[in-house]
């Protein structure tokens, strides 16, 4: 028998520095977690103790903090090289700055293979990107070889900016021939490493003949065997065992997100490459693991540029940006409108001639807007200003909801109106009218939404049974501020870009902004 240790991360999302337990900015260092310096210590400790170790990443290193905003992927290549990753799969967020924003900082600089079998380049891009990412890679490990085959969510064109010259094929259809190829090369130990979410990971384990282990990402799935060490609730045991269609037991793993855990899976293979046993657990990277001094010094060195960036002007406002709780928790506020407009703008994807865009709606809890921005400071808006407005380090995500769920959400928005509570919704691509004289749960008297399947966008009444795409904070997607109906009834959830980054990009693009209060949210009394 031959034993392999697989160390894995996924959805790190630019958390190069240690973070608080909830993966936001580290405040009390003695209670902070993760970060590449701490990750390096644990990885090296395991490499010290075990002879056959692979360190893999299942995508979405890009996007999530000011590190990505400033360094644009150069930081990912540099620190992943320093940690000596053995392979990485492309995630959807690796395309956030377009194909060029992937090629130059990451693909050309990485000293490890970057993989995806279901992304096919065409046109002029095909020769430009040739060899920079691969469908699979055979890695020598000790006296053996291990095949790693990559995959990426086929929803990427709706979630990011891969352009028109990359085709995202069905994962299973694309993976099978590559695995077959590895088998003909006498590679009998094969890991599928990819970024399509836990449901697809399980399908790959079930359907793709010859895959021995699946290491996934995208859905931020936390798996654990035994008592979990922090706040995350396991979605199943680690590893999650899937019985394949040809009767094999295939371990599937994922390691939550944000570099909080290091996935640790030990696999025992027989001489024919069959999995005899698999066991392990994610390792919580808490403060009991010291940050490596060499990597930490490097982080501190790279950090300097971030501090300078925070105070530079992104753009100007010629109006007061009212982010006060007195406004945003009671009525339409222009800061809410600005943020929602930025959220929609960030999700413009012309992927179908029938649709002007795939999504037109935004909702945003007023309690998530934490500060106004005064225009009387020469109109200057900085990252620092935006960090005061959006201090929680969240993301603006894409969900699919039924109209009936949206209606419930808007009823919840005003169910206890007047108490300055955070659930009051700011909107974009939505016109809502409330009648507060009616009883809670029956106060939404008009709810019109902007069409997407139209050449001239206009507002139509919400249909209860129709499925709509909506951009919203991850806080709401996870049921925050009492929006349990969103969490319970959402049909799809894809994590998006860092909230501050979305707004800062929009302001930089617009140069001068002047958001108004324009009647998106109205109040009425009497008959309708």
């Amino acid at each position: 028998a031959w034993e392999l240790t697989i160390l894995h991360t996924n959805d790190v999302h630019s958390r190069l520095e240690q973070t608080s337990e909830d993966s936001s900015k580290c405040v009390n260092a003695s209670r902070c977690m993760g970060g590449v310096a701490r990750l390096f210590t644990k990885v090296q400790q395991i490499r010290r103790a075990e002879p056959n170790v692979l360190l893999l990443d299942a995508g979405d290193q890009y996007q999530g903090t000011i590190w990505f905003t400033v360094y644009k992927g150069a930081e990912v290549a540099h620190f992943m090289n320093a940690l000596r990753y053995d392979a990485m799969a492309l995630g959807n967020h690796e395309f956030d700055n377009g194909v060029e924003g992937l090629i130059e900082p990451l693909l050309k600089e990485a000293k490890f293979p970057i993989l995806s079998a279901n992304i096919k380049a065409k046109g002029p891009l095909a020769s430009q990107i040739s060899g920079l990412y691969l469908p699979y890679k055979v890695l020598p490990v000790g006296d053996e070889v291990v095949g790693i085959v990559g995959y990426t969510s086929k929803e990427t064109p709706f979630l990011s900016n891969p352009g028109t010259n990359l085709v995202f094929e069905d994962e299973i259809t694309a993976l099978q021939p590559e695995v077959d190829k590895l088998k003909t090369l006498n590679v009998n130990k094969i890991i599928a490493l990819g970024h399509s979410g836990f449901e697809m990971d399980k399908l790959i384990a079930q359907k793709v003949r010859g895959v021995d282990v699946v290491v996934g990402g995208h859905s931020n799935t936390f798996l654990y065997t035994g008592n979990p060490p922090s706040k995350e609730v396991p979605a199943g045991k680690y590893p999650f065992i899937v019985t394949s269609d040809d009767g094999r037991k295939v371990p599937v793993v994922q390691a939550y997100a944000f570099g909080k855990y290091l996935g640790y899976l030990k696999i025992e293979f027989d001489e024919r490459g069959n999995v005899i046993s698999s066991h392990g657990n994610p390792i919580l990277l808490n403060s009991s693991i010291p940050e490596d001094p060499s990597i930490k010094a490097d982080i501190n060195k790279w950090r300097i540029k971030l501090d300078n960036y925070s105070t530079q002007e992104l753009g100007k406002t010629i109006v007061y940006l009212d982010g006060s709780s007195q406004s945003c928790r009671f009525r339409e506020c222009n800061m809410g409108n600005l943020i929602c407009d930025a959220m929609i703008n960030n999700n413009l994807r012309h992927t179908d001639e029938m649709f002007w865009n795939h999504v037109s709606m935004c909702i945003l809890n007023g309690g998530g807007i934490r500060s106004p921005i005064d225009e009387r400071n020469n109109g200057t808006i900085t990252w620092e200003n935006l960090a005061a407005v959006l201090p929680f380090g969240g993301t603006f995500d894409l969900v699919q909801l039924k109209g009936s769920t949206l209606k419930k959400a808007f009823e919840h928005s005003v169910h206890r109106y007047g108490q300055s509570t955070g659930e009051f919704l700011q909107v974009g691509g939505i016109h809502v009218v409330y009648d507060l004289s009616r009883k809670p749960g029956d106060r939404v008297v008009k709810l019109d939404v902007l069409c997407t399947k139209c050449r001239v966008p206009s507002y139509d009444p919400l249909k209860m049974d129709e499925v709509y795409k909506v951009i919203l904070p991850n806080f709401l997607a996870n049921g925050g501020d009492g929006f349990q109906m969103i969490k319970d009834e959402l049909l799809r959830h894809d994590s998006g870009d860092q909230d501050i980054n979305v707004v800062s990009t929009y302001i930089s693009k617009m140069k001068v902004i002047y958001p108004a209060v324009e009647g998106r949210i109205k109040f009425s009394t009497g008959s309708h």
């Epitope: 090296q44 010290r48 103790a49 170790v53 320093a82 000596r84 490596d292 010094a297």
Partner: antibody
Framework: DVKLVESGGGLVQPGGSRKLSCAAS????????MHWVRQAPEKGLEWVAY????????YYADTVRGRFTISRDNSKNTLFLQLTSLRSEDTAIYYC??????????????WGQGTTVTVSS | DIVMTQSPASLAVSLGQRATISCRAS??????????MNWFQQKPGQPPKLLIY???NQGSGVPARFSGSGSGTDFSLNIHPMEEDDTAMYFC?????????FGGGTRLEIK
Amino acid sequence: DVKLVESGGGLVQPGGSRKLSCAASGFTFSSFGMHWVRQAPEKGLEWVAYISSGSRTIYYADTVRGRFTISRDNSKNTLFLQLTSLRSEDTAIYYCASDFGSSSPNYFDYWGQGTTVTVSS
Amino acid sequence: DIVMTQSPASLAVSLGQRATISCRASESVDNYGISFMNWFQQKPGQPPKLLIYAASNQGSGVPARFSGSGSGTDFSLNIHPMEEDDTAMYFCQQSKEVPWTFGGGTRLEIK
């Protein structure tokens, strides 16, 4: 368990050559930088040379540059130090030490038992 | 090169008492907020063993009675309470820049 075993020491004439080896086991050798450190009889420690995990980065002490060559074979889990143009002041116990770092040096965390090189006519 | 000066050259301490060894660097060994100072213990006929790295972090399996402190150019190694097994040579070493340099050593014995 981490094990580093040096070999190849012995008596060499001034101007002569010697190749030291360090066999590593019990860990993923290819993930760690490696050093040679020497200690002259009844003296302190002197760092000699460093090689990164993938052999991309190599450093030498001024006292040995041009005479000693550090190399490694990751497939055989072995570190080498080729000694040439030996002088009497090169007489020492030669330790191989692993670095906790990978591509850039960090700190020596494990040491072998050492092999003795005596340069004398 | 950074010159490391250790003091005292030798030290005798009673069992259960505190032993303090100092090390001064000819220039700062700090780099971006990290002090690249390490301490080693060496017993006769044995290779050195890592005690402390980055000024204050304990090496793997090192007893809690060994602690390190300092920054910039001035560092110290503390052993408390002193045990019989602690009789050895102690070396400081900087890993801020090439060439890595060691102090001349401090011989610690029981009084």
